[in-house]
Structures are given as C-alpha cells and as structure tokens.
C-alpha cells in the first residue's frame, strides 16, 4: 500500500476541481489537495467518470481522458491516505464538461473515417436533419505527431454524403498508432452544433490493393505471387484469393492467413511479397486471378476493411469450343 | 434512369401488421436517404420515415414513432418499412421515394395502397 | 412543425394560359422549397427544388420564385398536359412539410 499511517476518519474533499480542453478531444481535469488533511497522511486519489466507469487510484492531482464531446462527461474525485481500494474516500467532488452548445438535430451525423494505406485519412458525413442545405462544413483535425490542430482544405459532395480528405503518414515511431486521431466538423457560420470522433489508429485501416506479380503452374497447382501494398508487413494481412475458371465456368475464393513464399518455385527474398499455392488448378484452361487483402487481429483492432481487388492476371488458354 | 418500385400494401386488421418493400436503381443507391411517404385524401401528403444511404441513421414523424422501423439492403438495393400496431388513421397509399441532395423527393415509386380495416 | 399553406386550393384556366400558385410557410424557411405535380392515379413528380433550380428532364415553362415564407410557381403558357395537382414542400426544417394542394382544372 501507499506511505503513511492509514486515519480512520475520511479526509476532507479535494479542492479546485477544474476542467479544460485541450486539442480537439483532450479533457483535462486538475485538482488541488484537500485543505486541512491530515500530516500523516501520504494522499491519494480516487476518480472515476460518472457511470462509475474507469475507477483510478493515483497520487497524480490530473487526469485526463481523450472524449469525444458529443454529451455531457463528468468526472468525481475523492482524496484517501493509501492504495488501499477498499478504504472510503473522502467526499466525492464532481466537475463536468458539456459540448459546444446548439440544436442536436444540426449536429452531422455518421463522421466516419478510414485511413487508406496509412497514408491518409479520409472522412465522410451525413449533414443534420436540421441543417440549411447550403451549410459550408469545415472540418479540423489533431494527432500527436501535429504541433497544432489543422483544418482539412478539400470539402467534397459525393451523393447527400459530405467528406474531406487529409495526409496521415505512418511514422516509423513506434508509439505512432498507439494514438488515436481527434476530429471535428462544424460550419463557418457557427449555426450547427459541432460533431466529435475519436479515430484510433489501429481501427479503420483500408489497404490498398495488392499486385499480382507472378502465375505460374507446377505440379497441377497455380503458383501465385504478389507484392503487398506498402506500409504493410505480410504478416499483418489477410489475403482472399480468386481464381475463375473460364472453362469449368468455376468460380473459387480461397482465404489466406499466411502467404509466405517457402517453396523453390517461388521467387525468393523478394522483400513485401506473398505467395500462395492453388491446388488442382488445370494449365490448358484460362485461369483468372484476382487478390484482395485487409489488415488483420495480429496487428489491428478491426479487420473488417477489405482493399478493392487488385488488377487481374489471367494464365493458361482459352480452349477453342469445338 | 432512376427507378423507385414499392410493394407490399394489402389490407390488414387493427393491430396487425405489415411489410413494405422498395426497389430501386439507377444511382448510386448507398449514397441516398431513402423515405416513404403516404397520401390520404383527408391529410394530403405526409413524410412517414426516412433512412441514410449507409443505414445508421433513421428518421421518423411522431406520429408512427414507436410502431414503424425502416431499414435497407444496400446489397439488394432495398429498402423496407416495417408497420406494427397499425391504426385505421395508417391507411393511405405509401410511396417511396429517393431524396434529392438533400430532403426533397426527386424520385417516386408509383404508390403501395394500405388498408387498415377490420 | 412547419405549416405550408398553398392558394388557391383549386383553380380553372385554359389551354395557353399563364398560371401562378403560391406557397406560404407558418415561418421562414429560405429557399428551401420543392413543388411536385401529381396527376390523378399517379405518384407526384418533382418539378422544382430549391425555390427555383428546375428538375432536369422538366419543361422550361414552369418556373419557381420566392425566399422566406413566400414563394410562387408559374406556368408561362398552359399545355393540356399540366392539368393536375401542385404540391409545394418545405425541407428547410425537420420533418419536411408539404402544402395541401391545388388543382388546376381545364375552364
């Protein structure tokens, strides 16, 4: 447990509970000690937000929580004489922060993003119900690698949909996808009410389609190779493989967790390249190939962005019908 | 061409319930809310519901809140009006309809008739 | 929710004629305004969108005007052919409102 003599009467209540917000999504609550505790006392303190959520014991006078401000968030904060969980704190003294103020029903909705080939992030939304058709959105965005918040430049309609994209670039820093982007759109005229969204960097991911580099039969199977979108490691993908067959009118998808490129007949050493074996695939027919990838657990949260299919490859001959 | 074909109207009970279906091409479907719409001679024409393009957002007037649900297939592009506990006031003739960039309607189903009638 | 309120509810002209309907909103609502054409038995069809952009595909001779609370279509010479009802749609606010309608006749 923490230094000191545990007292048994509760100590008094924190004081100067403060909260700010820094970035677009940072909330910051501060605290001075409680006046009058007790000299034996080596404090600690206890928060946690108001759905009893995130409980933290610290001897830190600060905590602060990346939120998207889209609701009210509050966080209580009591004082005690050890880590001990089981010991009552002091008086619970709560400080809230609300979000910007306007008509919920002009706030967008749906603010979405993707990060392509974390290379960039694209973000896509839905205007309010209440919202004048010719609302000018901006859109700003913050991730730790920014000196300061930036405001995306490109605005586009695609169907009743608005979105902009911005430059992201994957660091070699390794920490760099341990943070999360913070986003918010709002308008010129500040008439809606601003939307927030907390991106994490390890969600979201959309790669870019893989190239097929080589087809190759060997033993009545279809050897295939491909080079992986860059910014990926092999292991951190997972491949769909198609091959249609024009004369069997077959059509076969094949999913692949591994894809290493073990076997002689691959071209070896061939840095961010996969390879995967078709078994009972016939030479004297054409075969189409086509790839797909999409980032999986090992390395992501989500793996539910599938790339779009790489260009096709096709090998073999087109029997004559006879 | 866009198309917009709505199906499904028949008569039902009181607190019975009923499916409308609603077909349509030529846009790009996932881009669009799609809404439905009923004409009354009595009230004239009445926004009902309303679903976006991507399916997270729906919309509804107050008057069915509660008893109608509405959701799309983008796959299929469909989308379906669920009507529970329908009241002899829900009969009219329901059309879908593709909004336009934003809550107008610029394409319309030729109309589903829907009788409330015990 | 916004009340729209179309004038006149029924109205008798002839062929070649120049034909106005107006549209009155409960409050302001810009130029956010639709009118629809519904012929008998059919759905409604829509004709103009934001106070006054015409529909593609729609005939030059309807056009619409107005901002606000107070807003017009016209029809610069009739054609047997737009014998029908106008609806006239606010989408300024949620949840969109439409007026009750006016028929136009042959006299």
């Known amino acids: 447990g923490g230094g000191g003599a545990a007292p048994t009467e509760t100590q008094p209540p924190v004081t100067n509970l403060s909260v700010s917000v820094e970035n677009l999504c940072t909330v910051i609550w501060t605290w001075n000690p409680p006046e009058g505790a007790s000299p034996n006392c080596s404090l600690w303190y206890f928060s946690h937000f108001g759905d009893k959520q995130d409980k933290k014991l610290a001897p830190e006078t600060r905590r602060s929580k990346e939120v998207p401000l889209n609701e009210k968030i509050c966080l209580q904060v009591g004082s005690q004489c050890s880590t001990n969980e089981s010991e009552k704190p002091s008086i619970l003294v709560e400080k809230c922060i609300s979000p910007p103020e306007g008509d919920p029903e002009s706030a967008v909705t749906e603010l979405q993003c993707i990060w392509h080939n974390l290379s960039y992030m694209q973000c896509s939304w839905l205007p309010g119900r209440n919202t004048s058709p010719d609302t000018n959105y901006t859109l700003y965005y913050w991730h730790r690698s920014l000196e300061k918040i930036r405001q995306c430049e490109e605005i586009y309609k695609e169907g009743q949909y608005f979105g902009c994209s911005f430059d992201l670039t994957k660091v070699k820093d390794s920490s760099f996808e341990q943070h999360s982007v913070q986003i918010m759109v709002k308008d010129y005229a500040g008439k809606i009410k601003p939307s927030f969204n907390i991106v994490p960097l390890t969600s979201r991911v959309k790669p870019d389609p893989p190239h097929i580099k080589n087809l190759s039969f060997h033993n009545g199977d279809l050897h295939v190779q491909w080079e992986n979108p860059q910014n990926f490691i092999s292991r951190c993908l997972f491949y769909e493989v198609e091959v249609n067959n024009s004369q069997t009118e077959t059509h076969n998808v094949f999913s692949v967790q591994e894809a290493k490129c073990q076997n002689p007949e691959f071209e070896r050493n061939v840095e961010n390249t996969s390879c995967f074996m078709v078994p009972g695939v016939l030479p004297d027919t054409l075969n189409t190939v086509r790839i797909r990838v999409k980032t999986n657990k090992l390395c992501y949260e989500d793996d539910k962005l599938w790339s779009n299919w790489s260009q096709e490859m096709s090998i073999g001959k087109k029997r004559n019908s006879t | 061409e866009v198309q917009v074909l709505d199906s499904g109207g028949g008569l039902v009970q009181p607190g019975g319930s009923l499916r409308l279906s609603c077909t349509a091409s030529g846009f790009t479907f996932r881009l669009y809310t799609m809404s439905w719409v009923r004409q009354t001679p009595g009230r004239g024409l009445e926004w009902v519901s309303g679903?976006?393009?991507?399916?997270?957002?729906?919309y509804f007037a107050d008057s069915v809140k509660g008893r109608f649900t509405i959701s799309r297939d983008n796959s299929k592009n469909t989308v379906y009006l669920q009507m529970n506990s329908l009241r002899a006031e829900d009969t009219a003739v329901y059309y879908c309809?593709?909004?336009?960039?934003?809550?107008?309607?610029?394409?319309w189903g030729q109309g589903t008739l829907v009788i409330v009638s015990s | 929710d916004i009340q729209m309120t179309q004038s006149p509810s029924s109205l008798s002209a002839s062929v070649g004629d120049r034909v106005t309907i107006t549209c009155r909103a409960s409050q302001g609502i810009s130029s956010w305004l639709a009118w629809y054409q519904q012929k008998p038995e059919k759905a409604p069809k829509s004709l103009i969108y934001a106070a006054s952009s015409l529909q593609s595909g729609v005939p030059s001779r309807f056009s619409g005007s107005g901002s606000g609370t107070d807003f017009t279509l016209t029809i610069s010479s009739l054609q047997p052919e737009d014998f029908a009802t106008y609806y006239c749609q606010q989408y300024n606010s949620h949840p969109p409102t439409f007026g009750q309608g006016t028929k136009l006749e042959i006299k």
């Open positions: 309809a593709k909004e336009g960039d934003w809550i107008y309607f610029d394409s």
């Open positions: 679903i976006s393009g991507s399916g997270l957002s729906t």
